[in-house]
């Protein structure tokens, strides 16, 4: 059965939408499931049906129960069920779990907390916001339309946030409160096709015969912790370990750096006592992750030991 849980507090307004959708022109009939009694549509009733909406103005604990909505749509009538629970108001500040709407997460760059279910009500700004029952004050907090914006979010901003607003129905005002938890998380990571920062594609690296040379393969893979990412060097398409030249070694361990928040890896290729034959080799910097592999090729050229500058 297609049902939706709804809850509210006694003496507050509660508006419930039929879980089955329909065009505005469709007729919707509401019934109290236990008695199969039709819900009236006349607005003079405390509990009445208004199209897809069932309104409790205000709600009472005795209203709790399952309500059936039948959308009189073409082809087939669609049936939905609204499981409504009305709770007594708590005397203390704690909001019990059963009154909490879904938890939302925010970060330094995105800290909107939407007031749950507000779109069902006829309300006017501003919204009042509370954290752990304390009214929010200060320039960091901005009530904007149906959400709260927190500037420069910190871990201490985590907690239970309650929005309070007034629903107006034919000139009568009813209070509504809704609470949800807010957690603060690090900016969400992501992964992208490897980007090799160094060396440049087809780069020519000048080296001195008989001296040591270092080549650095550096690539970035996205933001945050990466599930699978690696950089490595190949010689003439062969892994360094399989090439069998002890003078040429990869630096053990990959350095992980976070430049501009990006997850990047470096691998240094060390060539001891550079020889003429090293100039004939093709050096490939490889960067790979789940998205694929990127390759930049480097060649070595002889650098004169003594450079004469005029």
């Amino acid at each position: 059965k297609f049902s939706k849980q709804s809850w509210g507090l006694e003496n507050e307004a509660l508006i419930v939408r039929c879980p089955r959708q329909g065009k505005p022109s469709y007729t919707v009939d509401w019934y109290y499931s236990q008695t199969n009694k039709s819900i009236p549509t006349q607005e003079r009733n405390r509990v009445f049906a208004s199209g897809q909406l069932l309104k409790f103005l205000p709600a009472a604990v005795a209203d709790s129960g399952i309500y059936t909505c039948i959308v009189r749509s073409p082809t087939f009538n669609r049936t939905g069920y609204a499981n409504v629970t009305i709770y007594k108001k708590q005397s203390d500040c704690n909001v019990p779990d059963y009154l909490m709407y879904s938890t939302v997460s925010g970060s330094e760059k995105n800290s909107k907390i939407y007031c749950p279910t507000i779109d069902l009500y006829n309300w006017t700004a501003p919204l009042e916001w509370f954290k752990n029952c304390q009214a929010l004050q200060g320039s960091r907090y901005r009530a904007h339309k149906s959400f709260l914006v927190i500037d420069n979010v910190m871990t201490e901003d985590a907690g239970d946030y309650t929005c309070k607003f007034i629903h107006n129905e034919n000139g009568a005002n009813y209070s509504v409160t809704a609470t949800r938890s807010f957690t603060v998380k690090d900016e969400q990571g992501f992964s992208l096709f490897p980007v090799i920062g160094a060396p440049a594609q087809n780069e020519i690296k000048e080296v001195e015969i008989g001296k040591n040379a270092n080549l650095t393969c550096s690539a970035c893979f996205g933001k945050g912790t990466q599930f699978l990412a690696a950089v490595l060097w190949q010689l003439n398409g062969t892994k360094i370990t399989d090439f069998g030249e002890p003078r040429i070694q990869q630096e053990e361990g990959q350095n992980q750096s976070f430049s501009n928040g990006l997850a990047c890896l470096d691998m240094v290729l060390r060539i001891a006592d550079v020889k003429e034959e090293d100039l004939l080799l093709q050096y490939d910097c490889l960067a790979l992750n789940l998205h694929g592999l990127r390759r930049h090729t480097v060649r070595l050229s002889r650098k004169n030991p003594i450079d004469h500058h005029s």
């Epitope: 329909g22 065009k23 022109s25 959308v71 073409p74 082809t75 669609r78």
Partner: antibody
Framework: EVQLVESGGGWVQPGGSLRLSCAAS????????MYWVRQATGKGLEWVSG???????YYPDSVKGRFTISRENAKNSVYLQMNTLRAGDTAVYYC???????????????WGHGTTVTVSS | DIVMTQSPLSLPVTPGEPASISCRSS???????????LDWYLQKPGQSPHLLIY???NRASGVPDRFSGSGSGTDFTLKISRVEADDVGVYYC????????FGGGTKVEIK
């Protein structure tokens, strides 16, 4: 390509059972109502069952209590379990795509090729 | 149940000439959303039916513009402005206001 492929038809004795399957591809299956429509040889079309996006089912009186339609969104499949079959159920059974998202009606715009069910002793 | 009645039962046609099929429902198919829940389908010989017109007058994707649907309430008409040889088959109207019921069909054949 949007496609519906029926299977499971065959010959069965009166009182027997048969389960038809329909495999959908090329569209967001879970967003559509799905129907079964049958056609006896040389006769017209008759709707025999429907299932909506949330799994509620609909039947004409002629098959109510004997036929059960079900869907498995994870497998993009809809099924028709036919019990207590009668000679009058002999027909080609078509799997058909219907209403989108509960109320967007564009007709029965995709039909399978059909699977033949024969009920005789 | 809504009963759908089609006429004629059989319609011999000449290629290039117009043709018209009528469909009548036992109750109005006009819904409160302003749509008539009436479709037209063509079943060519040896094939599955396919949709021509939905909601009374909307041509389905890929349907040539020589096909048109009209009518409202209980009386509906499918017109073919210039019949082609490929148009032969059985044409069905179907109501989708309360469950689904089909008309008995109109067999269109070349004279």
């Amino acid at each position: 390509e949007v496609q519906l492929v029926e299977s499971g038809g065959g010959w069965v004795q009166p009182g027997g059972s048969l389960r038809l399957s329909c495999a959908a591809s090329g569209f967001t299956f879970s967003s559509y109502d799905m129907y079964w429509v049958r056609q006896a040889t040389g006769k017209g079309l008759e709707w025999v069952s429907g299932i909506d996006t949330v799994g509620d089912t609909y039947y004409p009186d002629s098959v109510k209590g004997r036929f059960t339609i079900s869907r498995e969104n994870a497998k993009n499949s809809v099924y028709l379990q036919m019990n207590t079959l009668r000679a009058g159920d002999t027909a080609v059974y078509y799997c058909v795509r219907g209403i989108y998202g509960d109320f967007y009606y564009y007709g029965l715009d995709v039909w399978g090729h059909g699977t033949t069910v024969t009920v005789s002793s | 149940d809504i009963v759908m009645t089609q006429s004629p039962l059989s319609l011999p046609v000449t290629p290039g000439e117009p043709a018209s099929i009528s469909c009548r429902s036992s109750q109005s198919l006009l819904y409160s959303d302003g749509n008539n829940y009436l479709d037209w389908y063509l079943q060519k010989p040896g094939q599955s039916p396919h949709l021509l017109i939905y909601l009374g007058s909307n041509r389905a994707s890929g349907v040539p513009d020589r096909f048109s649907g009209s009518g409202s309430g209980t009386d509906f008409t499918l017109k073919i402005s210039r019949v082609e040889a490929d148009d032969v088959g059985v044409y069905y109207c179907m109501q989708a206001l309360q469950t689904l019921t089909f008309g008995g069909g109109t067999k269109v054949e070349i004279k």
